[in-house]
C-alpha cells in the first residue's frame, strides 16, 4: 500500500514481532498523505501499519527498546 515511498493505506493483517527487524515513521506533514509506521520484515518486505493501533504501538516499543540496548 505504498507509492513513491509513501504509504497510502494500512495492512489489515497483524504481524508478529518476531518477523520484524525495524521500522520507519511516515509523517503526514512531511510530504505524505497519512501518518504510518512502515515495518521492515526479515523477508525484506515493507508493510504499512496504522500508528494508532495497539499492536503497532507494542511493536514500535519493542523495537525502540532493542535499538537502545544495542
Amino acid at each position: 500500500a505504498s507509492n513513491f515511498d509513501c504509504c497510502l493505506g494500512y495492512t489489515d493483517r497483524i504481524l508478529h514481532p518476531k518477523f520484524i527487524v525495524g521500522f520507519t515513521r511516515q509523517l503526514a506533514n512531511e510530504g505524505c498523505d497519512i501518518n504510518a509506521i512502515i515495518f521492515h520484515t526479515k523477508k525484506k518486505l515493507s508493510v504499512c501499519a496504522n500508528p494508532k493501533q495497539t499492536w503497532v504501538k507494542y511493536i514500535v516499543r519493542l523495537l525502540s527498546k532493542k535499538v537502545k540496548n544495542m
Partner: antibody
Framework: EVQLVQSGAEVKKPGSSVKVSCKAS????????FSWVRQAPGQGLEWMGG????????IYAQKFQGKVTITADTSTSTVYMKLSSLRSGDTAIYYC??????????????????WGRGTLVTVSS | QAVLTQPSSVSGAPGQRVTISCTGS?????????VQWYQQLPGTAPKLLIY???NRPSGVPDRFSGSKSDRSASLAITGLRAEDESDYYC???????????FGGGTKLTVL
C-alpha cells in the same frame, strides 16, 4: 461479562520480590492488550507496562524497566506482574486492566475499560 | 512529573458545567493520538468515561463529553451532581516514549 480477578494484598520486606496475578474471564484472552497501572498512596495513576498474550513479549515504561516483569499464561488466561528489589517507595495499589477493543483497534487503543479491584503491596521492614 | 498536565483541582455547584483540561505536547495529543478520560471514586478502581477523544462507553451518562484540539483535550461535565465528586485522569499515547501516559489527575469538588 469480562472480569479481571487479582490476587490478594501482600506485605513484603525491602529487597524481596512480589508476583501479582490477574485472571481474566468472559472473552478471548489472546485478542487483547493487558496493562498494569500503579497508584501510590495519595498519588495519581502511572502506566507501568503491558502485554499482548499473542505476542508473548511485554513492553514497559522506562521508569519500570528492570524493576517489573510482566508475563501471560494463555492456558489459564492469567497475566502476572512481578516486582523485584522492593523498596518502601513501591508501596502502592497495583491495578491490572484490559483494553476495550482488540489489539487491532485504533479508536479504542489504550482505552482501559476493564479493571481489576487492585492489589495493595506494602513494603515494610 | 506527569507528561500530560491537568489542573490539580476544579469545583462547581450542583447543576453547573465544569471543564477539566489536559495539556500535552507534539509527541502525544499534538501527534493526533487519541485521549481517554477516567473517573476514580475514592477507594475504587478507575472507570473509563471517554475513549477516542469523544466516545462514551455504554452506561456513561451523556452529561460527560470529551473534546480535543491541537495539543490539549478537555472533559466537560454538565448538570453537575454530588456523585460526580471524584478524581479525573486523562490518558494518551506518547510517540517519543512509545508508551501510554496519564495526566496527574484532577480532584473535582461539588460545592
Amino acid at each position: 461479562e469480562v472480569q479481571l480477578v487479582q490476587s490478594g494484598a501482600e506485605v513484603k520486606k525491602p529487597g524481596s520480590s512480589v508476583k501479582v496475578s490477574c485472571k481474566a474471564s468472559g472473552d478471548t484472552f489472546d485478542s487483547y492488550a493487558f496493562s498494569w497501572v500503579r497508584q501510590a498512596p495519595g498519588q495519581g495513576l502511572e502506566w507501568m507496562g503491558g502485554i499482548i498474550p499473542m505476542f508473548d513479549t511485554p513492553i514497559y515504561a522506562q521508569k519500570f524497566q528492570g524493576k517489573v516483569t510482566i508475563t501471560a499464561d494463555t492456558s489459564t488466561s492469567t497475566v502476572y506482574m512481578k516486582l523485584s528489589s522492593l523498596r518502601s517507595g513501591d508501596t502502592a495499589i497495583y491495578y491490572c486492566a484490559r483494553e476495550w477493543g482488540g489489539y487491532y483497534s485504533s479508536e479504542s487503543s489504550g482505552a482501559l475499560q476493564y479493571w481489576g479491584r487492585g492489589t495493595l503491596v506494602t513494603v515494610s521492614s | 512529573q506527569a507528561v500530560l498536565t491537568q489542573p490539580s483541582s476544579v469545583s462547581g455547584a450542583p447543576g453547573q458545567r465544569v471543564t477539566i483540561s489536559c495539556t500535552g505536547s507534539r509527541s502525544n495529543i499534538g501527534a493526533d493520538y487519541d485521549v481517554q478520560w477516567y473517573q476514580q471514586l475514592p477507594g475504587t478502581a478507575p472507570k473509563l468515561l471517554i475513549y477516542g477523544n469523544n466516545n462514551r462507553p455504554s452506561g456513561v451518562p451523556d452529561r460527560f463529553s470529551g473534546s480535543k484540539s491541537d495539543r490539549s483535550a478537555s472533559l466537560a461535565i454538565t448538570g453537575l451532581r454530588a456523585e460526580d465528586e471524584s478524581d479525573y485522569y486523562c490518558q494518551s499515547y506518547d510517540s517519543s516514549l512509545s508508551v501510554w501516559v496519564f495526566g496527574g489527575g484532577t480532584k473535582l469538588t461539588v460545592l
